[in-house]
């Protein structure tokens, strides 16, 4: 109906579009205004959501188009604006004007099941009504229109078991189930709309019922007599056989327990397998051919759990009988003890009796033993197991040995035990005591008398049942060593005193003085020890802290002077080498282009100061240092060996520092001299040419520090191939050609 | 740019319908109004009726019982049906755009197709 | 319905002249919403002035279009050769859209 609005002068209706037409553009309807008098003067105009996408205008008419299908489940309303413009002045002529749209319902949407799946568990044997599930279907059509959204629900498949109730979908049991014949139902429900009236539209769901499983069910033995054989030596806890009773039912309501009946020794024990729900016969304790070698008992076998409604279907539990037959088996020999501990005192001649371990044979037989032992090379064994030492023993050496016995049987060698034997040496008072560390003891020249020059403390090696006690003295031999005196501290430290005021470096450099330890164990023992003190130059501080490091040098008899300018020729010698290193290392170009050198390079680093040893094995020093143009020498390494050698002998012995510093100046000279000696410490790299070369070695590791120059004019003689030798090393005044 | 081309059957029985289609190329035919025009032969022009490309549609008074202009936006085209012909509607007959763009009202034709001759004869 | 009559039904001119052609109707046009088509021999019209006196796209500064109300007139400064041809006017103000019979413009 079109309505007149004399206030906005619009001529317009509420428009309804049925929804999903197919046609390209749908007519709604005309907006109209009463002003339009068709003079080409109006323009009408459509707003809001939907305009322009949705629904079109027709600007010069006012007519509305739908230009799409529209789906009113998607949306049922479309609320729009309308304006009328005056096409001179752009202006509206009259004011906005708001109008609905609304898509009319068709039945085009069939009751859909949203839950789905649908799947229920309901108890077997459940009773006749009870409920199972309910389906709900969904239709999307307008419950105001008609019946297009009215459901019945109707059982497609299910009967006889199952019912729908109509109007609710509401599935309930029709008859009873056994779990037992069949698990799982399937059941389709359809969903009409329309209430079922022609053109109605139908939507099905299936719905998976399954059974579950109640104890309606006892378990039964499959078999009702088992036969089982064990051998004798079987261990505690063998699995003698299986045994299996079935229950139709599952899960928990099929969960079994065995229990063994007609066992009053308790040998056998029945645990179950909860895989396979089998009962496992065990050994609970062990059997003896020799006692009994048949046993008969009965198995009995019930649910875990039954509820009380359902026990009269448990009553008389299942039963079966086993019988179990032991076999013989010829065991190993059985010691009397798992284990033996024997004692014997340190220091008894060997042939002594430690003590005996014994072995029998377990079967009918009896068989004799024959024992070994092993372990230890400090004992042996009689065939009777009679332990005995074959050695002297020594506690200080080993306190304690872990022997094994191994027993065999005459009759059958394969058959062995063992039994471990541990032997305890007693201790007897044979170590002496001894110092507990060794002592570098200074005295300052300036000392004066009573001053402490060292505390000393010892060792025993020996067990003591009480703690160790030592005695210290100054042996009554040591009559040159009146410049100390010891004095015993009681609590096994004794300290060694200056006995004078003053001592001379250069004169008296190492005093030597002879201490008596003595043990408080029965017998008491003594040990002689010498104890080396050296004479210091401490300055004023007189403090021997400095001592050490400076001993060597000062007993040598160098000055701070002295040892600062070897420090700096060292240096020099050093720097001097490292920079021949890099300019050779710049260098690109060899130096005799005709014949590439063969160069083997070995570095070689000494971490102890003897030793030197290991380079032998790399390469021949005597072989790379021969020239027939040199004198023959003793290679460098093992004179520099000697050196330290007796630097070390320096420290402990302390020899006349007159000859010592002689024989230093001596091997400095020597070394000085030496045209193959590289400094002390410096990487070597040796350009070996190989023997047979009449020039002997051109490496600039031949060179000398001293003015005196090899000839190498005879390389003139040589022919065009040493030309540029020549040219090199010859005599600087070349003949005139 | 774009270009009308009418096609449709030159001769047509009297009291028959005829058929005329106008195919838009170069452009859409959304968002224009088109028009049919004709010409009787050594006669002036005259107006049949416009379609706008969702279906709505003004006819001439004169001929509105007989017309019917709808539209195929698929195809980019739109048709003339002139029901119950005599000799009289014997004509030259033009497709042609409105050149104002979604106008308010109607616009002078600025695009004209080539024109069909239909002759109205037994 | 607006009828257009158009005047003279012929007009006959050279080349370089003034062309003035004349077009009355019988009610007044809204908006002045009128326009003038060119048409020549076998082929169709040509829009050369729409809103009684705006230039269409393409159209020499020759033609111009005037007037408002009920007359209206479409004056060729200058005639070209190419210029003579038949004439209408439309109006587009009222519905249903009318033409006028046309002038036909030839050379003299």
């Known amino acids: 109906d079109y309505k007149d609005d004399d206030d906005k002068g619009w001529v317009w209706n509420q428009f309804f579009v049925p929804e999903e037409m197919n046609t390209t553009s749908h007519h709604i309807g005309q907006l109209r205004s009463d002003l339009d008098n068709g003079n080409n003067s109006f323009q009408y105009k459509l707003l809001g959501a939907g305009a322009g996408s949705t629904f079109i205008i027709d600007e010069r008419t006012g007519d509305i188009y739908a230009i799409q299908k529209l789906d009113r489940e998607e949306r049922s309303l479309y609320i729009l604006r309308a304006q009328v413009i005056d096409i001179a002045t752009g202006r509206a002529v009259e004011p906005e004007s708001e109008f609905v749209i609304k898509v009319s319902d068709i039945n085009d949407n069939e009751p859909r099941f949203l839950d789905e799946p649908y799947e229920a568990i309901v108890p077997e044997m459940s009773p006749e009504g009870t409920f199972v599930i309910k389906v709900t279907a969904n239709d999307a059509d307008d419950p105001s229109t008609g019946y297009h959204a009215r459901i019945l629900y109707n059982l497609e498949r299910g009967q006889p078991y199952f019912s729908v109730e109509p109007t609710t979908g509401v599935i309930r049991i029709s008859s009873k189930m056994d779990r037992e014949l069949q698990d799982t139902y399937c059941v389709i429900i359809q969903a009409k709309d329309m209430l079922g009236q022609p053109g109605a539209l139908s939507g099905t769901t299936t719905v998976s019922i399954k059974l579950s499983d109640i104890n309606d069910n006892k378990p039964i033995f499959k078999e009702s007599f088992y036969r089982f054989t064990i051998s004798e030596s079987a261990p505690i806890g063998t699995s003698i056989g299986k045994i299996m009773a079935y229950d139709d039912d599952i899960g928990e309501n099929a969960e079994m327990e065995y229990s063994i009946e007609d066992d009053d020794s308790k040998i056998f024990d029945i645990i179950i397998d909860n895989d396979t729900q089998e009962g496992i016969v065990i050994l609970k304790k062990k059997v003896d051919f020799e006692q009994q070698s048949y046993y008969g008992i009965r198995a009995k076998v019930k649910n875990c759990h039954v509820d009380e409604e359902l026990a009269p279907a448990h009553v008389n539990a299942s039963t079966t009988y086993i019988k179990v037959q032991v076999e013989d088996e010829d065991e190993p020999p059985v010691f009397l003890l798992p284990y033996y501990i024997l004692e014997i005192p340190e220091g008894k001649p060997y042939g002594t009796i430690v003590g005996t371990v014994s072995a029998t044979d377990p079967d009918r037989r009896q068989s004799p033993m024959r024992y070994y032992l092993t372990g230890s090379k400090m004992f042996d064994i009689n065939d009777n197991g009679t332990i005995i030492t074959t050695n002297m023993l020594d506690r200080e050496v080993s306190a304690w040995y872990n022997l094994t016995v191994t027993a065999t049987e005459t009759y059958n060698v394969q058959q062995i035990s063992s039994a471990h034997v541990y032997v305890q040496v007693f201790n007897i008072n044979d170590n002496a005591p001894e110092f507990s560390q060794f002592y570098e003891t200074y005295v300052c020249e300036n000392a004066e008398s009573g001053e402490i020059v060292q505390i000393i403390s010892a060792i025993d090696r020996d067990e003591s049942i009480e703690d160790h006690h030592f005695y210290f003295n100054h042996s009554l031999e040591d009559t040159n060593n009146s410049s100390f005196m010891l004095t015993d501290n009681q609590d096994n430290t004794a300290v060694i005193l200056s006995n004078r005021t003053g001592f001379n470096l250069k004169e008296e450099p190492v005093f030597y003085m002879i201490i008596l330890i003595a043990d408080n164990g029965i017998p008491s023992l003594t040990s002689t020890n010498t104890l080396t003190i050296q004479v210091c130059d401490c300055g004023d501080s007189r403090n021997t802290e400095t001592c050490a490091n400076k001993g060597l040098l000062f007993i040598m008899g160098f000055r701070t002077e002295a040892i600062i300018a070897i420090m700096i020729c060292v240096m020099v010698i050093f720097g001097f080498f490292f920079l021949i290193l890099a300019l050779k290392q710049r260098r690109k170009e060899t130096l005799f282009p005709e014949k590439t050198e063969d160069f083997r390079e070995n570095i070689f680093c000494y971490d102890d100061e003897g030793g030197g040893e290991e380079d032998s094995e790399a390469f021949d020093i005597v072989e790379l240092r021969q020239s027939t143009v040199m004198r023959e020498r003793k290679p460098q390494r093992s004179k520099s060996a000697e050196i330290r050698s007796l630097y070390r002998q320096s420290l402990q012995v302390g020899p006349d520092s007159a000859i010592f510093r002689k024989f230093i100046l001596e091997k400095l000279e020597e070394a000085n001299t030496d045209p193959c000696a590289p400094p002390f410490d410096s990487l070597q790299t040796f350009a070996y040419e190989g023997t047979g070369s009449s020039a002997g070695s051109l490496s600039s590791l031949a060179s000398r520090d001293t003015d005196q120059e090899d000839d190498f004019d005879y390389l003139n003689d040589l022919g065009p191939r040493f030309k540029r030798l020549a040219s090199m090393f010859g005599s600087a005044v070349q003949p005139n050609n | 740019q774009v270009q009308l081309q009418e096609s449709g059957p030159g001769l047509v029985k009297p009291s028959e319908t005829l058929s005329l289609t106008c195919t838009v190329s170069?452009?859409?035919?959304?968002?224009?109004?088109w028009s049919w025009i004709r010409q009787p032969p050594g006669k002036g022009l005259e107006w049949i009726g416009y379609?706008?490309?969702?279906?709505?549609?003004n006819y001439n008074p004169s001929l509105k019982s007989r017309v019917t202009i709808s539209v195929d936006t698929s195809k980019n085209q739109f048709s003339l049906k002139l029901s119950s012909v005599t000799a009289a509607d014997t004509a030259l007959y033009y497709c042609?755009?409105?050149?104002?763009?979604?106008?308010?009202?109607?616009?002078?034709?600025?695009?004209w197709g080539q024109g069909t001759m239909v002759t109205v004869s037994s | 319905d607006i009828v257009l009559t158009q005047s003279p039904g012929t007009l006959s001119l050279s080349p370089g002249e003034r062309a003035t052609l004349s077009c009355r109707a019988s009610?007044?046009?809204?908006?002045?919403?009128l326009a003038w088509y060119q048409q020549k021999p076998g082929q169709a019209p040509r829009l050369l002035i729409s809103?009684?006196?705006s230039r269409a796209t393409g159209i020499p500064d020759r033609f111009s279009g005037s007037g408002s109300g009920t007359d209206f007139t479409l004056t060729i400064s200058r005639l070209e050769p190419e210029d003579f041809a038949v004439y209408y006017c439309?109006?587009?103000?009222?519905?249903?859209?009318?033409f006028g019979q046309g002038t036909r413009l030839e050379m003299k």
């Open positions: 170069g452009g859409s035919i959304n968002s224009y109004y």
């Open positions: 809103g009684a006196s």
């Open positions: 042609a755009r409105d050149s104002r763009y979604r106008s308010g009202w109607y616009d002078a034709f600025d695009i």
């Open positions: 009610q007044s046009v809204a908006g002045s919403y």
């Open positions: 379609i706008y490309y969702i279906g709505s549609t």
């Open positions: 439309q109006q587009y103000g009222k519905s249903p859209i009318t």
